[in-house]
Interface confidence: medium
């Protein structure tokens, strides 16, 4: 996590800063948004537990052609220690449940805010 922050960052970013930046980006793409995100695309729901960053990326990476979540995908890749490609699935996916991207992002956002308040930055 010490290398998070993307191309614009001058150096390593503390995990707390990286998590807050991810939260901020999720807020940016959901605030006052009523139109379906990514044209209403559906993604696999995930268990919001340990390893959820990779699971979240595995779900969202299957959404293509949606500029609104491209930055989120890049940021999530910084939290995931291994390379993720489309079609890849982990045990954290709830494989029988698909939800809209907008709902997925809102659920993830609220969970990340909970983690941030609890000081769980990793």
């Amino acid at each position: 996590l010490t290398c998070l922050g993307g191309f614009a960052s001058p150096g390593p970013v503390p995990p707390s800063t990286a998590l807050r930046e991810l939260i901020e980006e999720l807020v940016n793409i959901t605030q006052n948004q009523k139109a379906p995100l990514c044209n209403g695309s559906m993604v696999w729901s995930i268990n919001l537990t340990a390893g959820m960053y990779c699971a979240a990326l595995e779900s969202l990476i299957n959404v293509s052609g949606c500029s609104a979540i491209e930055k989120t995908q890049r940021m999530l890749s910084g939290f995931c220690p291994h390379k993720v490609s489309a079609g890849q699935f982990s045990s954290l996916h709830v494989r029988d449940t698909k939800i809209e991207v907008a709902q997925f992002v809102k659920d993830l956002l609220l969970h990340l805010k909970k983690l941030f308040r609890e000081g769980q930055f990793n």
């Epitope: 939260i23 901020e24 605030q31 006052n32 948004q33 009523k34 139109a35």
Partner: antibody, heavy 126, light 108 residues
């Protein structure tokens, strides 16, 4: 009881400065997105700007007419929102309201907006 | 800069239905909010996220949205509903708030 109380208004000359405060109580202020809205005499409501909660990045946005002259800040330890107004113009004369922001409330964990203060009057005149 | 457009005034008789419109290019993707402001008082939220009514707001207040137009409907308007009504939303970025010019509702 959820409450917002503005203070700091008054008469100031063009080019002068003023700092408004908004004291919040009855809700988790640190989770709240907060806005300033103003209303010139006999005119409609005008959005001035908004500050997000720190956990949501603390981002501050301003309306074009005040950008570069007004500064919004917050002190979560004091449950207080501020509006620093510099280079005041006669057209800044208005009642200034602070309010919790519905847009942010939806994603927070407090029951939001619509809580408004009763407003504080700012008069810019020579 | 982004604008929301409302009619300056609407008049109805008591018991009639009042409709106040608000148009804006971003309304297909951004929610509208409606505020009631009586003379000398702070605004009160009567509708949020296009159609939702806060607790304590009478059922006669409802909201709808279609395309670039949001509408506040007061079914069976009463004398106490006489006030200025403002729509509020954000620009397409979601970062900048904007109010409509306001509509003066007269219940004669």
């Amino acid at each position: 009881e959820v409450q917002l109380v503005e203070s700091g208004g008054g008469l100031v000359k063009p080019g002068g400065s003023l700092r408004l405060s908004c004291a919040a109580s009855g809700f988790t202020f640190s989770n709240a997105w907060m806005s300033w809205v103003r209303q010139a005499p006999g005119k409609g409501l005008e959005w001035v700007g908004r500050i997000r909660s720190k956990i949501d990045g603390g981002t501050i946005n301003y309306a074009a007419p005040v950008k570069g002259r007004f500064t919004i800040s917050r002190d979560d330890s004091k449950n207080t929102l501020y509006l620093q107004m510099n280079s005041l113009k006669t057209e800044d004369t208005a009642v200034y309201y602070c309010a919790t922001d519905q847009v942010g409330a939806y994603y927070g964990d407090y029951y939001g907006m619509d809580v408004w203060g009763q407003g504080t009057t700012v008069t810019v005149s020579s | 800069s982004y604008e929301l457009t409302q009619p300056p005034s609407v008049s109805v008789s008591p018991g009639q239905t009042a409709r106040i419109t608000c148009s804006g290019d971003a309304l297909p993707e951004k929610y509208a909010y409606w505020y009631q402001q009586k003379s000398g008082q702070a605004p009160v939220l009567v509708i949020y996220e296009d159609t939702k009514r806060p607790s304590g707001i009478p059922e006669r207040f409802s909201g709808s949205s279609s395309g670039t137009m949001a509408t506040l409907t007061i079914s069976g308007a009463q004398v106490e509903d006489e006030a200025d009504y403002y729509c509020y939303s954000t620009d397409s970025s979601g970062n900048h708030g904007v109010f409509g010019g306001g509509t003066k509702l007269t219940v004669l």
